[in-house]
Interface confidence: low
């Protein structure tokens, strides 16, 4: 007689690992013989699929090699005519070993920025992702983290960070291994020690020491007046990251030394500087040489002093003018550190306004060198003490170089303001009235050694600071 | 990624000026650390440098071209122009405009393909 | 005006060092750029500030600048390094210099 479908041995859910046989089975009782059809996610199965096997009149579906994209609801339908179609439906989980997807890769990083070493798994059940560093298992805290995604974040990276890494992803069904990869870590050159100012007699040799660390181990050069140490000799040791080098000069005309400590970064270097003076007793001073250009200020040491946009004279007696001139300011700068609260804000805005000297906006720029009245203000006002400390040290030799600019203005050299207010520069920040002048305590007992004429206040208009000119 | 492309004509007559123009896309013309060169060279021979605009309009000139040479700009249409006037067989070269810029001590990092000038009557 | 002087040829056997010089008045104090330029194409930067390399250089360029003589130097020459090579410098005038040129050939 003629009997409806039934499924006697309902569909269920199947466990397979990759690239194993999953097999379903679909017993169904009935008369006559059933056509027995088979869907995955509702999407019929073809019976030439060759990834498939169908046997056994239809009741037997193998899947010969799991794919990790086999997941998923499949079905059986078995239909004879009599009575209606009957299914029955049951899962297919891929088990899968874990596997990592995204290996982590060396890394070369900057100390203090933050890495992040990559290990993407794939697995199931979900692969838990741990760390090795060298031989033992990595302990996360405040800065080392397991992302989510398996990925190490190490931030603001350390010197002790650097090493072997590799990541570990294990489930129930077994652990998969990176390879091992390195972390370098790089830190930008750092002088140690810089080399310090000289005042020598002529003739003398003098040794330039400097040290200075970074990873990659810095190369140093040296700089003499902005251009290539031409003679000298120069002596380097390297010991435990620590770069030494010594440059041992014969004496024959003053000059600024700069050590330059130099590390690579990819395709970025990082660089550290520091300059010291070699100054020759008894050196007779060249003429002031007025060769140079104009040029808003870039630095940083003269920032606060110099008015903004002030365009002032760089001279190329320097390779690089504006560097060459930073570094006289910053090493003057040094030398003040030792003086009075008073002096120091007027002898800055003194100094900054030498080296930077304001700029003539002529066809061929010339500096316009400070004004006499403001520079007797620095003189007998506010640095009285410190000034008779530099002119002692002036006298002897100290300050005497080449490179005039180093130098202390002689102020009665300088043009009076009262001459041509356009040919002498003011210092705005010592701009005060016969008001203000009593806020200032008295910097010695005597009396000043001139009389310092009013200088204008700042709200004068007869001598407002000199208009700023752009260069075409 | 800043492109230049020089465009003008391929002949000129002596005497007569010849004038070409460089349009830069990707970029401003008057953005501060950048320059804008013209440069040629004469068939089978080296590169010579003719003479900049700066980002503020400024311009210098090299100075054996000084008396026939002068750059404009058109910031609406972000180009450059350089016209040399009273041209000879001599100033038959390809003319290449480049960028200079600060970031690299104010080397030419991007130029033209080039165009082809010919002064003949 | 300010004279570079560069030699009209210079070969290297291949994967050997060749050394492109370039002479002028106290070059040391300026900064020297290099660009290399293959036939029917523009030139294209190689070097800048003297031994600075951008991005897509490779890095057998490498360059020293100092006294009288800036040189560039290419370790382990390659085939496709065969080309002209032009040294550049700016002047305190602002003017740009440019040398005369050097063939290099890879043999």
């Known amino acids: 007689l003629p009997k409806a479908p039934v499924i006697t041995t309902p569909l269920e859910t199947v466990d397979a690992l990759v690239e194993e046989v999953a097999t379903f089975m679909c017993a169904v009782e009935s008369y006559p013989q059933p056509e027995i059809s088979w869907t995955r996610n509702k999407i019929l199965i073809k019976l030439f699929d060759t990834r498939y096997s169908i046997r056994e009149n239809g009741q037997l579906l193998t899947i010969l090699s799991v794919e990790d994209s086999d997941d998923g609801i499949y079905c059986c339908t078995a239909n004879n005519g009599v009575g209606g179609a009957v299914e029955s439906c049951g899962a297919l989980q891929v088990k899968m070993k874990p596997k990592i997807t995204r290996p982590p890769i060396n890394v070369k990083i900057i100390e203090g920025l933050k890495a992040v070493l990559p290990c993407t798994t794939m697995g199931n059940p979900k692969p838990s992702v741990s760390w090795i560093k060298g031989d033992s298992p990595l302990r996360e805290n405040s800065r080392i983290a397991v992302l989510e995604s398996g990925s190490l974040r190490i931030h603001n990276v350390q010197k002790e960070d650097a090493g072997q890494y590799r990541c570990v992803a294990k489930n129930s069904l077994g652990t998969a291994y990176s390879k091992v990869v390195k972390l370098e870590v790089e830190v930008f050159a750092r002088i140690l020690r810089a080399p310090e100012s000289h005042n020598v007699t002529f003739g003398s040799f003098v040794t330039l020491h400097c040290t200075a660390t970074g990873i990659p181990v810095p190369t140093i050069t040296w700089i003499e007046n902005g251009n290539a140490v031409s003679s000298g000799s120069i002596q380097e040791s390297v010991k435990d990251r620590v770069i030494d080098s010594r440059l041992q000069l014969f004496i024959t005309k003053p000059g600024l030394y700069t050590c330059i400590a130099t590390n690579k970064h990819g395709e970025k270097f990082s660089t550290a500087k520091a300059a010291a003076t070699i100054s020759i007793a008894e050196w007779s001073k060249p003429q002031k040489d007025n060769k140079g250009y104009c040029a808003q200020y870039r630095g940083e040491v003269c920032n606060a002093v110099l008015a903004k946009d002030a365009l002032v004279f760089l001279n190329t007696s320097y390779a690089d003018p504006e560097e060459a001139q930073e570094l006289l300011v910053h090493t003057a700068w040094n030398e003040l550190k030792v003086v009075s609260p008073v002096c120091r804000p007027a002898a800055e805005a003194l100094l900054c306004n030498h080296i930077f000297q304001e700029c003539s906006p002529g066809v061929v720029p010339t500096p316009i060198p400070i004004c006499r009245e403001y520079c007797l203000a620095v003189k007998e006002l506010f640095c009285a003490k410190e000034w008779l400390v530099m002119e002692e040290k002036t006298h002897r030799g100290l300050y005497r170089s080449e490179m005039h600019l180093l130098s202390v203005p002689e102020c009665s050299k300088l043009p009076s303001m009262h001459w041509d207010p356009t040919a002498c520069a003011r210092l705005p920040h010592l701009d005060y009235n016969k008001e203000n002048l009593k806020t200032f305590p008295p910097m010695t007992s005597s009396k000043p050694s001139v009389d310092i004429p009013n200088l204008p206040s700042s709200s004068s208009s007869s001598f407002s600071v000199s208009p700023t000119y752009s260069m075409t | 990624q800043v492109q230049v492309q020089e465009s003008g004509p391929g002949l000129v007559k002596p005497s007569q000026t010849l004038s070409l123009t460089c349009t830069v896309s990707?970029?401003?013309?008057?953005?501060?650390?950048?320059?804008w060169s013209w440069i040629r060279q004469p068939p089978g021979k080296g590169l010579e440098w003719m003479g900049v605009i700066a980002y503020d309009g400024s311009t210098y000139y090299s100075p054996s071209l000084k008396s026939r040479t002068s750059i404009s700009r058109d910031t609406s249409k972000n180009q450059f122009s350089l016209h040399l006037s009273s041209v000879t067989p001599d100033d038959t070269a390809v003319y290449y405009c480049?960028?200079?810029?600060?970031?690299?001590?104010?080397?030419?990092?991007?130029w033209g393909q080039g165009t082809q000038v010919t002064v003949s009557s | 005006s300010y004279e570079l002087t560069q030699s009209p040829s210079v070969s290297v056997a291949l994967r050997q060092t060749a050394k492109i010089t370039c002479g002028g008045d106290n070059i040391g104090s300026k900064n020297a750029q290099w660009y290399q330029q293959k036939p029917g194409q523009a030139p294209v930067m190689v070097l800048y500030?003297?031994?600075r390399r951008p991005s897509g250089i490779p890095e057998r360029f490498s360059g020293s600048n100092s006294g009288n003589t800036a040189t560039l130097t290419i370790s382990g020459a390659q085939a496709e390094d065969e080309a002209d090579y032009y040294c550049h410098v700016w002047d305190s005038s602002t003017n740009a210099w440019f040398g005369g040129g050097t063939h290099l050939t890879v043999l």
């Open positions: 990707g970029g401003s013309i008057t953005a501060r650390y950048y320059s």
């Open positions: 480049a960028r200079g810029s600060s970031r690299v001590a104010a080397a030419f990092d991007s």
């Open positions: 500030a003297d031994s």
